[in-house]
């Protein structure tokens, strides 16, 4: 058993049918010695008397808010949560496996640049009685500071019969140098509590590996005289690291017909302009990627050909 | 120890070309190592990230773009934060700071070259003959060193008397390649920045 926060404790259980569970001793936080009784949650049934209460915690029915009283007055509370270990592996019931980029990916994180700011998000089908708290650091043995905000519900989607909820959190490394070569990964730890179930999820990454630039901005077309060709131009996104000559991007320009089946023409360039043939009803899209370290491509910025 | 926006020497552009070749070569070699050594811990998540140039060179700091010298986090890791004055920027010659940056890059390349050659000698003794260093990568390191045109005493190739542990050697190869790829990215950024300045 360990303390998650004041008066909230997590009991770790080897989870299998007929498991013996864990013996837990609760102590009433009071100078009083006599006349103390214990109850669980809203029930008035007295579970025991005395300054300490010994319980065998086996299932969720044994978890909850234990309260010690004296003469009708509440003295203190202890909330017991359960953390299930199933065959040596901690349970992952609360969050959905996003399966991207690989199986057992519960937390996904992205950064728009090298400033040390990043966003993480996760999915769940649970809508109520759910709380998250997020901590982060650079490295784990001698951790350096990363400050995270509160996790917020950022999107709701309908997936088949189920509703899916997306939560996200923004974090900022306290002292980040965009040019630094990372040798210690960022660690992100999410504590999730659903009713009386506790779970924790972690992700470990280098900022360089989670870079996804914003799409190029000010995408414009300039028709070339007496030609079906157009000059496409764009700019680096405002959120990208500067100077751009050091933090350079490479670009992919795509001409896509109205039908998804039509052949796509693609051009790769390090410049911020390109000459392409604009077909009728087609659209031109441009996306960006770090020129020197191949992390994710940005989303497409698009303009119609007409 | 930051990089001023100086007028580059005409010799800077070949360095950009060579540094791009270097990044391509080390990336290809790392990909090959990951595939060939699939039963070894060779992914970024599995290896310890070690920098053999740590405390020996200071490429990131010496080659810091001028725009980042205002960022305290980029300076506090250095023993001295050295902001060049205006007179340095006016110089038509490669400034003292740029020379410091390029010599630091040269020293990096020299250290990795020695490590890779020592490692290749061990890998050639492996009866499994599972993986060797790409000669193209070693050649590209050499080309960039020549383009940088610094003279420094040659470091003798390390020789080891004891029987090599091939498992450990292959894991060390992965560690080296990961670190060298990261340094090659920095070198490419620096050359691109100098080329644009």
């Amino acid at each position: 058993i360990w303390e998650l926060k004041k008066d909230v404790y997590v009991v770790e259980l080897d989870w299998y049918p007929d498991a013996p569970g864990e013996m837990v001793v609760l102590t009433c936080d009071t100078p009083e010695e006599d006349g103390i009784t214990w109850t669980l949650d809203q029930s008035s049934e007295v579970l025991g008397s005395g300054k300490t209460l010994t319980i065998q915690v086996k299932e969720f029915g044994d978890a909850g808010q234990y309260t010690c009283h004296k003469g009708g007055e509440v003295l203190s509370h202890s909330l017991l949560l359960l953390h299930k270990k199933e065959d040596g592996i901690w349970s992952t019931d609360i969050l959905k496996d996003q399966k991207e980029p690989k199986n057992k990916t519960f937390l996904r994180c992205e950064a728009k640049n090298y400033s040390g700011r990043f966003t993480c998000w996760w999915l769940t089908t649970i809508s109520t009685d759910l709380t998250f708290s997020v901590k982060s650091s650079r490295g784990s043995s001698d951790p350096q500071g990363v400050t995270c905000g509160a996790a917020t519900l950022s999107a709701e989607r309908v997936r088949g019969d189920n509703k899916e909820y997306e939560y996200s959190v923004e974090c900022q490394e306290d002292s980040a140098c965009p040019a630094a070569e990372e040798s210690l990964p960022i660690e992100v730890m999410v504590d999730a509590v659903h009713k009386l179930k506790y779970e924790n999820y972690t992700s470990s990454f280098f900022i360089r590996d989670i870079i996804k630039p914003d799409p190029p901005k000010n995408l414009q077309l300039k028709p070339l005289k007496n030609s079906r060709q157009v000059e496409v131009s764009w700019e680096y996104p405002d959120t990208w690291s500067t100077p751009h000559s050091y933090f350079s991007l490479t670009f992919c320009v795509q001409v896509q017909g109205k039908s998804k089946r039509e052949k796509k023409d693609r051009v790769f360039t390090d410049k911020t302009s390109a000459t392409v043939i604009c077909r009728k009803n087609a659209s031109i899209s441009v996306r960006a990627q770090d020129r020197y370290y191949s992390s994710s491509w940005s989303e497409w910025a698009s303009v119609p050909c007409s | 120890r930051n990089l001023p926006v100086a007028t580059p020497d005409p010799g800077m552009f070949p360095c950009l070309h060579h540094s791009q070749n270097l990044l391509r070569a080390v990336s290809n070699m790392l990909q090959k190592a990951r595939q060939t050594l699939e039963f070894y811990p060779c992914t970024s998540e599995e290896i310890d990230h070690e920098d053999i140039t740590k405390d020996k060179t200071s490429t990131v700091e010496a080659c810091l773009p001028l725009e980042l010298t205002k960022n305290e986090s980029c300076l506090n890791s250095r023993e001295t934060s050295f902001i060049t004055n205006g007179s340095c920027l006016a110089s038509r010659k490669t400034s003292f700071m740029m020379a410091l940056c390029l010599s630091s890059i040269y020293e990096d390349l020299k250290m990795y070259q020695v490590e890779f050659k020592t490692m290749n000698a061990k890998l050639l003794m492996d009866p499994k003959r599972q993986i060797f260093l790409d000669q193209n990568m070693l050649a590209v390191i050499d080309e960039l060193m020549q383009a940088l045109n610094f003279n420094s005493e040659t470091v003798p190739q390390k020789s080891s008397l004891e029987e090599p542990d091939f498992y450990k050697t292959k894991i060390k190869l992965c560690i080296l390649l990961h670190a060298f790829r990261i340094r090659a990215v920095t070198i490419d950024r620096v050359m691109s920045y100098l080329n644009a300045s």
Epitope: D14, W15, P17, D18, E59, E86, D87, I89, K104 | -
Partner: antibody, heavy 115, light 112 residues
Framework: QVQLVQSGGGVVQPGRSLRLSCAAS????????MHWVRQAPGKGLEWVAF????????YYADSVKGRFTISRDNSKNTLYLQMKSLRAEDTAVYYC????????WGQGTMVTVSS | SYVLTQPPSVSGTPGQRVTISCSGG????????VKWYQQLPGTAPKLLIY???QRPSGVPDRFSGSKSGTSASLAITGVQAEDEADYYC????????????FGTGTKVTVLG
């Protein structure tokens, strides 16, 4: 004590369907994940499928994906395996088992796919 | 499709020490726990070892398990006639958990 009693096995022709049941008692069935494991005659153990305690997630071996469906009825304390498009290679003893460091197995039920 | 490899058979005389190996990889045994089962003819498998080296109550202490790196082993110290059975190791793969990965199985024969 924990008990898993299986039923539903038998002889079936290729291409036909069969449903296996596993009735649980002696524990809070709705709190635990459950597996199906099979063993072809004279062969080793092969995992077939898994279902979470609440039925929210199901996982299948590639060899049965799209043909077999694992399900549970927590109100009846029963686990099911619906097998469709059966093949000769599905002939085996099928076991249900609880998920956890200590597990409990059903007695097994024989499924024979033969024309 | 077996990723955990066991020797097909091992044998020993009563009182001898018999060991069965179970060889896997970094993504299974290397990063997950191992169980061992005993299966007597015509019966369901019986758990012998869980979490690499733990013995459930009721399992004789002549059975012991260990794990090192990407392999595990089961030792029967002082093998007895009633130990003649098939033995299976079981683990998970970190990418496909909770799918069970079983070993190929080992037939233990007690001679004489």
């Amino acid at each position: 004590q924990v008990q898993l009693v299986q039923s539903g096995g038998g002889v079936v022709q290729p291409g036909r369907s069969l449903r296996l049941s596993c009735a649980a008692s002696g524990f809070t069935f709705s709190s635990y994940g459950m597996h199906w494991v099979r063993q072809a005659p004279g062969k080793g153990l092969e995992w077939v499928a898994f279902i979470r305690y609440d039925g929210s997630n199901k996982y299948y071996a590639d060899s049965v994906k799209g043909r077999f469906t694992i399900s549970r009825d927590n109100s009846k304390n029963t686990l099911y395996l619906q097998m469709k498009s059966l093949r000769a290679e599905d002939t085996a003893v099928y076991y249900c088992k609880t998920h956890g460091s200590h597990d409990n197995w059903g007695q097994g039920t024989m499924v024979t796919v033969s024309s | 499709s077996y990723v955990l490899t066991q020797p097909p058979s091992v044998s020993g005389t009563p009182g001898q020490r018999v060991t069965i190996s179970c060889s896997g990889g970094r993504s299974n045994i290397g990063s997950n726990t191992v169980k061992w089962y005993q299966q007597l003819p015509g019966t369901a498998p019986k758990l012998l070892i869980y979490i690499n080296d733990q013995r459930p109550s009721g399992v004789p202490d002549r059975f012991s398990g260990s794990k090192s790196g990407t392999s595990a082993s089961l030792a029967i110290t002082g093998v007895q006639a009633e130990d003649e059975a098939d033995y299976y190791c079981q683990s998970y793969d970190r990418g496909t958990h909770p799918a069970l990965l079983f070993g190929t199985g080992t037939k233990v024969t007690v001679l004489g």
